[in-house]
Amino acid sequence: KKVVLGKKGDTVELTCNASQKKNTQFHWKNSNQIKILGIQGLFLTKGPSKLSDRADSRKSLWDQGCFSMIIKNLKIEDSDTYICEVENKKEEVELLVFGLTANSDTHLLEGQSLTLTLESPPGSSPSVKCRSPGGKNIQGGRTISVPQLERQDSGTWTCTVSQDQKTVEFKIDIVVLAFQKASSTVYKKEGEQVEFSFPLAFTLEKLTGSGELWWQAERASSSKSWITFDLKNKEVSVKRVTQDPKLQMGKKLPLHLTLPQALPQYAGSGNLTLALEAKTGKLHQEVNLVVMRATQFQENLTCEVWGPTSPKLTLSLKLENKGATVSKQAKAVWVLNPEAGMWQCLLSDSGQVLLESNIKVVPTW
């Protein structure tokens, strides 16, 4: 008996060939011996089965001895053994129809779980193997669960259902709603304008929701809201902005915030939260601001940084074109009685300069 696997909603063709390449009488029946379709004279006739309105045959191939049955818009309950009667012989084809669907909306927030459920005919024992767009392989039986979706899980998932050494492939498009980056750090000299950008890792035709940037300044005892906003069809409108600092926000996506100037009291870390309408949960992106200040006061040249820096970062004071350097894995370095000239303050990570500020030391007479 031949086994054919089909996909719910799809079309399947069950083949039946006569030994002689000519038009002859044939019938397709189900396991209950109920006629589905056949030939009478030169015409296709249909029997009283449930399939009659969805079953057809390729008339153009009859004179070649091909008497296939095409079933459209497959249902799980179409799974059955079908019998083709031609030239006094019977050919049996077992059709197994499977369906694979996501248990919820296919637009899911990062961190949420995805469950794929396999619909299968009674008595079957299929196995399912799914491959994510990022190459992650997940195996299961009737259900496949991905407990925590990541950004890279966005895209087309390819799932293969296997039964009796036969396979059928399903493709499911999953959109993971997330920001492109989980975290970003902006390094700025004191007084410079700061640009924060929060690009999304997905596109939706209608994007509506609301959000807030909540900020914990390093020098502040508690965190506070810097800005709240609404998003209506990709248009951004500010709801409330704190008076200090007075942030500005772009009216279009990607979400874009401008801090007029970087000051030590603003250095710290923030969390931009975005709630999308009709979605449970929220999108988050962490943003850090590191501010550098180089100052000369009397005989002391100081360079300081504020904000979240890793302990492995190096802060250096260096006299241009000279070897004089002082370096520390600290948030402040200083030189007493510095030589006259252009000094550079550098914040670096394994030799890569993240931030620099120049200060001119004039000779004291």
Epitope: S210, E212, A220, S225
Partner: antibody, heavy 119, light 106 residues
Framework: EVQLVESGGGLVQPGGSLRLSCAAS????????MSWVRQAPGKGLEWVAN????????YYVDSVKGRFTISRDNAKNSLYLQMNSLRAEDTAVYYC????????????WGQGTLVTVSS | IQMTQSPSSVSASVGDRVTITCRAS??????LAWYQQKPGKAPKLLIY???SLQSGVPSSFSGSGSGTDFTLTINSLQPEDFATYYC?????????FGQGTKVAIK
Amino acid sequence: EVQLVESGGGLVQPGGSLRLSCAASGFTFSSYWMSWVRQAPGKGLEWVANINEDGSEKYYVDSVKGRFTISRDNAKNSLYLQMNSLRAEDTAVYYCVREGGQWLALDYWGQGTLVTVSS
Amino acid sequence: IQMTQSPSSVSASVGDRVTITCRASQGISSWLAWYQQKPGKAPKLLIYAASSLQSGVPSSFSGSGSGTDFTLTINSLQPEDFATYYCQQANSFPWTFGQGTKVAIK
């Protein structure tokens, strides 16, 4: 520790005036919007008014517009509610509230002061 | 914006799951908070942004919804949870509260 302490409540005749005060401590008062919320005896909560950090923006519920004035003195860490032309329906416990929660939530509340308008 | 809470009161036992709904007369996105008030005390913030738990609030409390329909769920009612609960919108002025739901001991 954030603390909000209301004062100035009491018994007043219809048409009379009263000034409520709220002393704030434990946070940078000048960095937050503040609100007044009231609750009539045995009834639900009703937001009355709010004011931004420097006092340049003020909003009121329709039923008190033109009669109540919200103000603040950041130097004194104080919030005020001047209530004029008082009516019997203004009888309530008045709460001083900080709008410091995430997503504009009202995160800290005073213990309330009772205002009774009766002849 | 009018906020309508239901039910206005509910009788429940310790360990029960209690669900309170709040409906806004127009869309308020996620600008919704839930408060708990005990007799003679000031209200206390439980949930902000429709579903985010305020720091220090037990995880037995949860919120959901966006737009016009919102829900507060108390998963396993504790003796200290018998109180009145209010929803409040912060989408547009004037801020408005629901009429309250009293959770009483059965």
